[in-house]
Interface confidence: low
């Protein structure tokens, strides 16, 4: 276990021509904050892919209003480090994304607005326990200077934080098979501590806190023998001793989710749904406060009222979950009024309004005939806030620009013949069928499958589809 630490030194205009103008002014007072996302390995995944090693959000920096006449300086930064705790081994190679966010504090409708100013990314090799590494990254005309390191949390040591050290119990030597913890010669390497309750006979661990099962045993603590019904399992190799299939390792076998998290398999891995107060790939990070940056996707973290809820994430639109980690289908709330089509674009929710309506949620009724013309002799009709053209014979569409052929779609079923009519179309049905589109068979006994006819219309009448 350990902590990745990031120290931002400066964020400001980079060298060379085309220096950016300050994002803050008297007109747009603002403050900065940073988000770091870590992924194991030298991945080149999209910025939106999960921060499997963890993520952190900085505090907000000081409110800044650029002084008149001053050149665009380095912008004031939040205090403190960004810390990303990791429970498992430090991978040695990692990818990072550092985002610089601006929080506008002007006279905004609906509270402060956040916008991404710059995003830098890189892939690095880093041994835990080493010195601070310095870096400079540029994003457009902006330049970010920062340092980072990975350090192990006691009792872990080593370049991957996988070795555990304990103070020597005797001054002379360490226990059998255990080496001194160089350079801490007064400490000894400690045996791995597996997950509490892990079966000493049927389980083992390669990293602290895990419990991996020997063949033939399963369960979170390797106490459950694999039953003979496993012969039906489609997964895993055939066992030479039993002649039946022994399940191979599934992503959720042994339940990798700690602290009461529930595991669900994904096509290539697993996903833990964590209870409040825990997060991380395996719900392994606990005792979380806002300083740990537990809120993802731009969620705003506020301190909770009691120790069991040390923080609460207020999620931006489009995200939910105790850590704002889940994308929500905002269109399911049906925010678009007056029949507008909802589009969830991720960064924004858009409503595509029906004719005659406008506004972010299609809430405005338009006088749509104003300044509008209906083509080909059509006349504009107002009604219900919607612009509608009453088209001359032979034309259709919203503005009567389309030449109408009501029979083009072959609307008459069961071999019925279609005739264009001044008010729509008429289907002449083949023998044995009836209905506006010849859709109902006439039963041999004379009854029909047609539902009860509306008043004034007999089931046998030819029907006009309007």
């Amino acid at each position: 276990a350990g902590v990745f630490e990031l120290q931002i030194h400066s964020f400001g205009p980079g060298p060379g021509p085309g220096a950016p103008r300050s994002p803050c002014s008297a007109r747009l007072p603002c403050r900065l904050f940073f988000r770091v996302c870590l992924k194991p390995g030298l991945s080149e995944e999209a910025a939106e892919s999960p921060c499997a090693l963890g993520a952190a959000l900085s505090a907000r920096g000081p409110v800044y209003t650029e002084q008149p006449g001053a050149p665009a300086p380095d912008l004031p930064l939040p205090d403190g480090l960004l810390q990303v705790p990791f429970r498992d081994a430090w991978p040695g190679t990692f990818s990072f994304i550092i985002e610089t966010w601006r929080e506008e504090l002007g006279d905004q409708i609906g509270g402060p607005a956040w916008s991404l100013l710059a995003r830098v990314a890189g892939r690095r090799r880093l041994a835990a326990g080493g010195p601070w590494a310095r870096d400079i990254q540029r994003a457009g005309a902006w330049e970010l200077r920062f340092s980072y390191r990975a350090r192990c949390e006691p009792p872990a040591v080593g370049t991957a934080c996988t070795r555990l050290c304990r103070p020597r119990s005797a001054p002379s030597r360490c226990g059998p098979g255990l080496r001194p913890c160089a350079p801490l010669e007064d400490e000894c390497e400690a045996p791995l501590v597996c997950r509490a309750g892990c079966s000493p006979e049927h389980g083992f661990c390669e990293q602290p806190g895990e419990c991996r099962c020997l063949e033939g045993w399963t369960g979170p603590l390797c106490t459950v023998p694999v039953s003979t019904s496993s012969c039906l399992s489609p997964r895993g190799p055939s066992s030479a001793t039993t002649g039946c299939l022994v399940p191979g390792p599934g992503p959720c076998d042994g339940n990798p989710c700690a602290n009461g998290g529930s595991c669900s398999e994904t096509p290539r891995s697993f996903e833990c749904t964590c209870p409040r107060g825990f997060y991380g790939l395996r719900c392994e990070v606990s005792g979380v406060t806002c300083a740990d940056g537990p809120c993802f996707n731009g969620g705003l973290c506020v301190g909770g009222a009691d120790p069991d809820s040390a923080y609460i994430c207020h999620c931006p639109p489009g995200f939910q979950g105790s850590n704002c980690e889940k994308r929500v289908d905002r269109c399911s709330l049906q925010p678009c009024r007056n029949g507008g089509l909802c589009l969830d674009l991720g960064h924004a929710l858009r409503c595509r309004c029906r004719a005659g309506f406008a506004g972010p949620r299609c809430e405005h009724d338009l006088d749509d005939c104003a300044g509008r013309a209906c083509a080909n002799g059509g006349t504009c009709v107002e009604g219900g806030g919607a612009h509608r053209c009453s088209c001359a014979l032979g034309f259709g569409g919203r503005d009567c620009r389309e030449r109408a052929d009501p029979c083009a779609a072959r609307p008459c079923a069961h071999g019925g013949r279609c005739y264009a009519h001044f008010s729509g179309l008429v289907c002449a049905c083949a023998p044995g069928y009836m209905g506006a589109r010849c859709e109902f068979p006439v039963h041999p006994d004379g009854a029909s499958a047609l539902p009860a006819a509306p008043p004034g219309l007999r089931p046998g009448d030819p029907q006009r589809y309007l």
């Epitope: 103008r21 300050s22 994002p23 008297a26 007109r27 001053a70 924004a348």
Partner: antibody, heavy 119, light 107 residues
Framework: QVQLQQWGAGLLKPSETLSLTCAVY????????WSWIRQPPGKGLEWIGE???????NYNPSLKSRVSISVDTSKNQFSLKLSSVTAADTAVYYC?????????????WGQGTLVTVSS | AIQMTQSPSSLSASVGDRVAITCRAS??????LGWYQQKPGKAPKLLIY???SLQSGVPSRFSGSRSDTDFTLTISSLQPEDFATYYC?????????FGGGTKVEIK
């Protein structure tokens, strides 16, 4: 090529509400200020207000009680409403695009709409 | 509100003349000022933004400068198509304010 096309009623009676819409073609809608500016006949330019794609808006205090600017990002349009108009509101009204945080840079303008207020 | 005092309100000049128009801000506005040209019946056209940056497509005879709260638009050699009205605009703070305009006429 970015184009701003505006429309709305050109003749109003006192106390009515002026309503204009500006459609943006051929460019990004986010990342810019979208402003309304007016010019009474023979006089100078006056900034009315602005909006950004998220709906955040700012108005000239001299008009704030009567003005409302809204945005419809699905159509790349923004609209101006000015209530209780008087003859003093007679002007050519322009919509314009301003770069976000880049200095005074109203780089694209609508063609202008002459609005006359007369009883 | 920030007041933008533009001078002169009008001037007469000949083709080839060097012309300077000034705007003074009532307080510091960094370099958040632009210059616009307007011809009768047309929308204004951006010439200079951020006090001294030439807008793309604008002839290089137009230039802008700043000294504290005084801003100057200079036309190095007046051309026939330059006869128009010129406005400055500050967007440092709300409300955005224009200068009163300078009408450049043919002498």
């Amino acid at each position: 090529q970015v184009q701003l096309q505006q429309w709305g009623a050109g003749l109003l009676k006192p106390s009515e509400t002026l309503s204009l819409t500006c459609a943006v073609y051929g460019g990004s809608f986010s990342g810019y200020y979208w402003s309304w500016i007016r010019q009474p006949p023979g006089k100078g330019l006056e900034w009315i207000g602005e909006i950004i794609h998220s709906g955040s808006s700012n108005y000239n205090p001299s008009l704030k009680s009567r003005v409302s600017i809204s945005v419809d990002t699905s159509k790349n349009q923004f609209s101006l409403k000015l209530s209780s108009v008087t003859a003093a509101d007679t002007a050519v009204y322009y919509c314009s695009r301003g770069e976000y945080g880049s200095g005074s840079r109203f780089d694209y303008w609508g063609q202008g709409t002459l609005v006359t207020v007369s009883s | 509100a920030i007041q933008m005092t533009q001078s002169p309100s009008s001037l007469s000049a000949s083709v080839g003349d060097r012309v300077a128009i000034t705007c003074r801000a009532s307080q510091g506005i960094r370099d958040d000022l632009g210059w616009y040209q307007q011809k009768p019946g047309k929308a204004p056209k951006l010439l200079i933004y951020a006090a001294s940056s030439l807008q793309s497509g604008v002839p290089s005879r137009f230039s802008g400068s700043r000294s504290d709260t005084d801003f100057t638009l200079t036309i190095s050699s007046l051309q026939p198509e330059d006869f128009a009205t010129y406005y400055c605009l500050q967007d440092y703070d709300y409300p955005l304010t224009f200068g009163g305009g300078t009408k450049v006429e043919i002498k």
